[in-house]
């Protein structure tokens, strides 16, 4: 059909930078590159119907369904979703194509379904059908990668049994310590499953899919390095594969490496050796100890020995199920308003944890750093000096852990007042929790020095706002103070704040803050 317009349907995935919800046709977002949805003519349909490829969207993801129409003249349009018409505002791009967009913000189950776009151009009418569904991430998994020896080759295969199929990459680094951080120039990444170059200093394999990224480091003992001051420890669960690499460099080839478990040499078939000459003509040997599926009796001290280097050992511990070891007692901190401070949790865990820090129902990303002693640490510094309860939550496949922290910020009280016909109340959030005084202002006491003690009711910690205590004091009105100005003052070790209230005046109460 010569009259049919050229139509392009695209999907644009957005990285959300706003928490608004709704549909809109012009919404500022960070965008990914558009994905062509094909838009083919649907056969045997009454009228001209184009069908876009089905769209699967993650829960809470934001997308734009977009149609580009290459047809002469103006176009008008209408979106229909679940029998409701939705506003449609076409515009023209630089190539003079008609552009119609539907933005779906923070995808939910209710926004899944068929989106019909009716377009009327000067030449013809046609319909475009989009089917949007929520991706079933319940079936998704991301498993930590593990290593296998490649059959008949001196190479390692990295395997991650994940859904959807993950992208596997080797992360290699040839320098020591801090310079092997992920974004360092010393780090080389290879997007492949098989690795032949096994002589590097630091070797990790990472797998990533829609659920994130998981990495496994090739546990290495380097006989040319001074041993760690704490015993290197490797945890594994029953049935997982064990891989330990022993590496040594010497001026010539005249040395050999051996592995022992406790005092017995490893059985043949549980190790393999590789060697190469380095650029300065020294010999590098590596000896792998491996067990394809560990059992409890594979626990013990694995010692790598050399005829030209001092031996080094690591403790391999096989556990039935994963664990998270840390002290879960709650911790309270009291800091000044500008004091630098971070919460921190030290833990030992296997497998590696996923964690979050939460404050005031908002979650923050959680970073963890391995320490030399086999422990890890997670710190949270982004509290912006907001007092309240902070929660650290960690979990792995087998265990969960939660720890509570309370942050108190030392500051002078701030007073808010409110009054009714029968009483006046003052509130303060200073810390340490303030004490209260009420004073009456009269002819006899123009400076408001006459203290009121009758009818005062103090409540420490009246309401708890995400762990932030608020103190209040209420004055019940008596004939003796009606029509007078009264002053409530909150004071702690950092200062005093007061608020003056006119009692029993008609209309809204005037409050005078005098600090």
């Amino acid at each position: 059909n010569q009259d049919l317009p050229v139509i392009k349907c695209v999907l644009i995935n957005h990285k959300n930078n706003d928490s608004s919800v709704g549909k809109s046709s012009s919404y500022p977002m960070v965008s990914e590159s558009p994905e062509d949805l094909g838009c083919a003519l649907r056969p045997q349909s009454s009228g001209t119907v184009y069908e876009a490829a089905a769209v699967e969207v993650d829960v809470s993801a934001s997308i734009t369904l977009q149609v580009l129409v290459d047809a002469p003249g103006n176009i008008s349009c209408l979106w229909v979703f679940k029998h409701s018409s939705l506003n449609c505002q076409p515009h023209f791009d630089l190539q003079n194509r008609g552009v119609v967009s539907m933005v779906i913000l923070k995808m939910t189950e209710t926004q899944a379904g068929e989106y019909l776009l009716f377009i009327q151009s000067e030449a013809t009418n046609y319909t475009i059908l989009f089917t949007v569904s929520i991706r079933n991430t319940l079936l998704y998994t991301l498993r930590r990668p593990y290593f296998r020896k490649m059959e008949n080759q001196d190479a390692l295969v990295c395997i991650s049994e994940s859904v959807p199929e993950p992208i596997v990459e080797w992360v290699l680094c040839d320098s020591q310590g801090e310079s092997c951080k992920e974004e360092s120039p010393a780090v080389v990444k290879k997007e492949e499953k098989v690795l032949h170059e096994l002589f590097g200093t630091d070797i990790r394999c990472c797998a990533r899919n829609e659920l994130g990224r998981e990495c496994t480091r090739l546990f290495t003992i380097d006989l040319n390095q001074t041993p760690q001051t704490t015993l290197p420890q490797l945890f594994l669960k029953v049935g997982e594969p064990l891989w330990i690499r022993c590496k040594a460099v010497h001026v010539n080839h005249g040395f050999g490496l051996t592995w022992e478990l406790e005092n017995k040499a490893l059985e043949e078939g549980n190790y393999f050796e590789m060697s190469t000459y380095s650029t300065n003509r020294t010999m590098i040997r590596i000896l792998f100890a491996f067990v394809s599926s560990v059992a409890r009796n594979d626990t013990g001290y694995y010692t790598c020995s050399s005829s030209k280097h001092p031996s080094q050992s690591a403790l391999v511990t096989i556990v039935e199920k994963g664990f998270i070891n840390a002290t879960n007692s709650s911790e309270d901190y009291e800091i000044d308003q500008y004091e630098e401070f971070c919460f921190s949790v030290r833990f030992k865990a296997y497998p590696q944890i996923r964690c979050t820090w939460t404050f005031s129902r908002k979650s923050f990303p959680c970073e963890q750093k391995g320490l030399d002693n086999g422990y890890s640490i997670s710190k949270f510094c982004n509290h912006k000096h907001q007092p309240g309860e902070y929660i650290f939550h960690a979990e792995n496949d087998d265990a969960q852990f939660t720890k509570m922290f309370t942050l108190n910020i030392r500051r002078k009280p701030q007073v808010l007042a409110e009054a009714s016909a029968s009483q006046a109340s003052c509130f303060s959030d200073g810390y340490p929790l303030p004490s209260w005084t009420w004073k009456k202002c009269s002819d006899k006491s123009p400076n408001c020095t006459e203290e009121i003690t009758e009818g005062v009711w103090n409540r420490k910690a009246n309401r708890k706002v995400f762990g932030q205590w608020v103190s209040s004091s209420t004055l019940n009105m008596s004939e003796a103070i009606k029509g007078f100005l009264v002053k409530c003052c909150a004071y702690n070790s950092l200062g005093t704040s007061c608020e003056t209230i006119l009692l029993n005046s008609p209309g809204p109460f005037p409050f005078i803050q005098d600090n």
């Epitope: 290197p232 010692t303 031996s311 080094q312």
Partner: nanobody
Framework: QVQLQESGGGLVQPGGSLTLSCTAS????????FAWYRQAPGKQRELVAF???????TDVESVKGRFTISGDNDKNTAYLQMNGLKPEDTAVYYC?????WGQGTQVTVSS
């Protein structure tokens, strides 16, 4: 885990001698996996001498001909015989065996 206990450190004049001992407990013992390290103030821990997998004792260049490592399997003990001591040998000396470290013994060479 193995427990290691060093002894024999002390103050000695340049040119003098000391013998350090390191006794292991809590594990079956094999002298082949023993090593001595030292750490001078403000410096990294460094290797001094070790017994290799084939039972040979090896010293690093800076102590060659002056220090000797040996051991007694029956007594679960390794030794470091130090002769011709120099002020630059001043350090805390540690023994290492199968992933475990002793708590260290101070050797001070001074006139």
């Amino acid at each position: 885990q193995v427990q290691l206990q060093e002894s024999g450190g002390g103050l000695v004049q340049p040119g003098g001698s000391l013998t350090l001992s390191c006794t292991a407990s809590g594990s079956t013992f094999s002298i082949n996996h023993f090593a001595w390290y030292r750490q001078a103030p403000g410096k990294q821990r460094e290797l001094v001498a070790f017994i290799s997998s084939d039972g040979r004792s090896t010293d690093v260049e800076s102590v060659k001909g002056r220090f000797t490592i040996s051991g007694d399997n029956d007594k679960n003990t390794a030794y470091l015989q130090m002769n011709g001591l120099k002020p630059e040998d001043t350090a805390v000396y540690y023994c290492y065996y199968r992933g475990s470290w002793g708590q260290g013994t101070q050797v001070t060479v001074s006139s």
